[in-house]
């Protein structure tokens, strides 16, 4: 194919690729016509002038994983079709003036994951043509003013893994065209008013793991058009009431690892297009009503791993969408009956790792999709009568690791365990923690003739019961079942009964990982 | 002391239908499952189905002709099964809880023209 | 359905010897780390009498003689010392799922 170098191979397609430690220049003599060329993993160390005078069709140029960290101005000249220049993964500290003078039909430059100390305006000021610009991985610590005024056509700005601890607010000015901005993992401690004003087009917003402690009231006010918005794992501690009020197109917005405090009502959106809302390990303690009643096509609300010890019964109105609630690792010890009954659309919620004492028996009266409770790791000792039973699509309750009391109160829900095991899975089976002689065993084989009479008289759940059994379609009113009855009457049907005894240890422990944060 | 106490002995046209009561006392009779189990003359143990708070589950081959319900002021379950033939012949027991505790005396149903 | 095969068909043992007898599941009965597995005792002309649930379990009043064990599919129940009162037949069966299926059964008589 027009002379192919020994340490290449080339293909009908006009593809070149050169490969080997043994490579330390670039091989001569190269194809005339090769339009794609890819120098990886060589020990090549400098680009010197014109070493590509002669393939002057090339539309894109590799130069990667080298050792590459000296290039000569002239080095692309006569590249005039190149439209693809990667020098990505190479040792690359310093970018000589002028070096991409000639490549008028550069679309797409990757400089990521070298060890660029600084940009300036001269660089770039000849790439008018450029679409996307990944510098990521550097060690740039500012950004000139300039530096990209040139590049009005860009649609693709990588700036993340660098050194950045300020942004001067005219930077981006003149990056009307800008989709993808990410700013991701500098040191970044705030962001001045108007830095993004100018980026009109603007769809991906990436600024997570910096130190951002301030967000700006109007910082995104002129960025209707943005619909991923990553502000996770930086210092924010509160969220001014109009930060997110220009965001119509927003589907997706991470806020986790901050330290939120609070969220006041109306401080999301309208945000009609918001699929995910991640906000766990943050500080919150309460959720007030309303909080996300702007967000109508919320599917995923994560709030695991705050502070929160109450949640008001409007918390989640709206949230007529919401397919996963991830509530655990909180605070929780008491939650209102109504507290989920606007979410009809609710598939997986997960309370492990609260103080959740004792559920109301409506908890999840509306609920009827719920395919997944976690509910371990509580201090729950009982649970309401019937409090499962309309849940036909129920196949994960995981149970374990609370204190359940085996007196003949328990009955009710170890029946239910038993009959429904189906599906639930093979997940760990609920232990007794009392009374103590049998603490340690397990719940769904306790011996029934010698269980032990309840001392108290429990809550009596405030809904009519319509258990659900797949061959039972309904039931008239005559044969619906009354909770009161059994719960309230005294206990001489247990005057022969005396201790629990339960004879198995075992205990299997399992975890997913729904909902680790 | 549990007790479940079954009716008496029926014998049945082909066609016919048939109602067995189990009366439960000595226990708090919501707080558990009664199954139903029938036994063909020399034969082994099959299940039918079970009834727990109104809510029902059938053993397919008896779903449609075996109806299972309960009276709850009275502590009584009653399995009904249509449409008899010969081959119900057999003692239908009532049982109790998940694993069958305790068991009724069982009841003859005789199926014969 | 899980089938429940059951062996011997009947067993003959001397008073004080022990019994055993098998069950094997045409799939796994276990859920939760525990085996749904329960064995019956039928004398001639009564009901059944449960003597072991969940595997290894005993039910409410039953002799110390008799013991149960196993999982996923294969279960054993052993009478350590046969006693005249034991004579009966001997029924296995799964609780796991629903159909709840009964093995066929094994008579247990004196040598």
């Known amino acids: 194919y027009h002379g192919c170098p020994s340490e290449c191979t080339c293909s009908r397609a006009s593809q070149v690729e050169c490969t080997g430690a043994r490579i330390v220049a670039v091989p001569t003599p190269l194809p005339w016509n090769a339009m794609s060329l890819q120098i990886l993993n060589t020990h090549i160390t400098e680009l010197n002038e014109s070493p590509f005078l002669n393939i002057s069709a090339l539309i894109a140029l590799r130069i990667e994983k080298n050792e590459l960290s000296r290039i000569t101005p002239g080095a692309f000249r006569n590249l005039g079709s190149l439209r693809y220049l990667s020098l990505a993964n190479n040792k690359l500290q310093v970018l000589p003036i002028g070096l991409f003078q000639g490549l008028d039909s550069l679309e797409s430059l990757l400089l990521s994951s070298n060890q660029l100390l600084q940009i300036q305006p001269a660089h770039f000021s000849q790439c008018s043509n450029l679409k996307e610009l990944q510098l990521h991985g550097n060690h740039l610590e500012y950004i000139p003013d300039g530096a990209f005024d040139h590049l009005v056509g860009l649609t693709k700005l990588n700036l993340g893994k660098n050194s950045l601890t300020h942004i001067s607010p005219r930077v981006f000015q003149h990056l009307g065209n800008l989709q993808v901005l990410r700013l991701y993992e500098n040191r970044l401690t705030d962001i001045p008013m108007g830095t993004f004003d100018g980026l009109v087009n603007l769809q991906e917003l990436a600024l997570q793991q910096n130190q951002i402690g301030l967000l700006s009231p109007g910082l995104f006010h002129n960025n209707h058009n943005l619909q991923r918005l990553y502000l996770s794992n930086n210092h924010i501690s509160q969220l001014p009431p109009s930060v997110f009020m220009q965001l119509p197109q927003l589907n997706r917005l991470t806020l986790f690892g901050n330290s939120l405090k609070e969220l006041s009502p109306g401080i999301f959106g309208p945000m009609p297009n918001l699929r995910e809302l991640w906000l766990y390990d943050n500080h919150i303690s309460s959720l007030p009503d309303n909080v996300f009643s702007n967000l109508r096509q919320l599917q995923v609300l994560i709030l695991s791993r705050n502070q929160i010890s109450f949640i008001s019964p409007g918390a989640f109105n709206g949230l007529t969408e919401l397919r996963e609630l991830s509530l655990h690792t909180n605070a929780l010890q008491d939650l209102d009956g109504n507290v989920f009954r606007m979410l009809a659309n609710l598939q997986n919620i997960s309370l492990q790792n609260n103080r959740l004492r004792q559920l109301p028996g409506n908890i999840f009266a509306n609920v009827n999709g719920l395919m997944a409770i976690q509910l371990q790791n509580n201090q729950l000792e009982n649970l309401p009568l019937g409090i499962f039973d309309h849940l036909g699509k129920l196949c994960e309750l995981r149970l374990y690791d609370n204190p359940w009391r085996c007196d003949s109160d328990i009955l009710p829900l170890r029946n239910w365990l038993l009959l429904n095991q189906p599906r639930l899975g093979t997940d760990t089976v609920p232990v007794c923690f009392s009374p103590a002689n049998v603490r340690g065993q397990s719940l769904i084989i306790i011996n029934v003739n010698v269980a032990v009479p309840s001392v108290h008289v429990p809550e009596v759940p405030s809904y009519p019961e319509t258990p659900w059994y797949p061959d039972t379609p309904s039931y008239p009113d005559t044969t619906s079942v009354s909770s009161t009855t059994e719960l309230t009457s005294p206990v001489e049907d247990y005057t022969d009964l005396t201790t629990i005894q339960v004879t198995d240890d075992r205990s299997v422990w399992g975890m997913t990982q729904a909902q680790s944060g | 002391q549990v007790q479940l106490v079954q009716s008496g002995a029926e014998v049945k046209k082909p066609g016919a239908s048939v109602k067995v009561s189990c009366k439960a006392s000595g226990y708090t009779f919501t707080s558990f499952v009664i199954h139903w189990v029938r036994q063909a003359p020399g034969q082994g143990l099959e299940w039918m189905g079970y009834?727990?708070?109104?809510?029902?589950k059938y053993n397919e081959r008896f779903r449609g002709r075996a109806t299972l319900t309960s009276d709850k002021s009275t502590s009584t379950v009653y399995m009904e099964l249509s449409s008899l033939r010969s081959e119900d012949t057999a003692v239908y027991y009532c049982?109790?809880?998940?694993?069958?505790?305790?068991w009724g005396q069982g009841t003859l149903v005789t199926v014969s023209s | 359905d899980i089938v429940m095969t059951q062996s011997p068909d009947s067993l003959a043992v001397s008073l004080g010897e022990r019994a055993t007898i098998n069950c094997r599941a045409s799939?796994?009965?276990?859920?939760?780390?525990?085996?749904?597995m329960n064995w019956y005792q039928q004398k001639p002309g009564q009901p059944p009498k449960l003597l072991i649930y969940a595997a290894s379990n005993q039910g409410s009043g039953v002799p110390d003689r008799f013991s149960g064990s196993g999982s996923g599919t294969d279960f054993t129940l052993t009478i350590s010392s046969l006693q005249a009162e034991d004579v009966a037949v001997y029924y296995c069966?799964?609780?796991?799922?629903?159909?709840?299926?009964f093995g066929g059964g094994t008579k247990v008589e004196i040598k």
């Open positions: 069966q799964q609780s796991k799922e629903v159909p709840y299926t």
């Open positions: 009834i727990y708070n109104q809510g029902t």
């Open positions: 049982a109790r809880d998940y694993y069958f505790d305790y």
């Open positions: 799939e796994s009965v276990d859920y939760y780390g525990i085996s749904f």
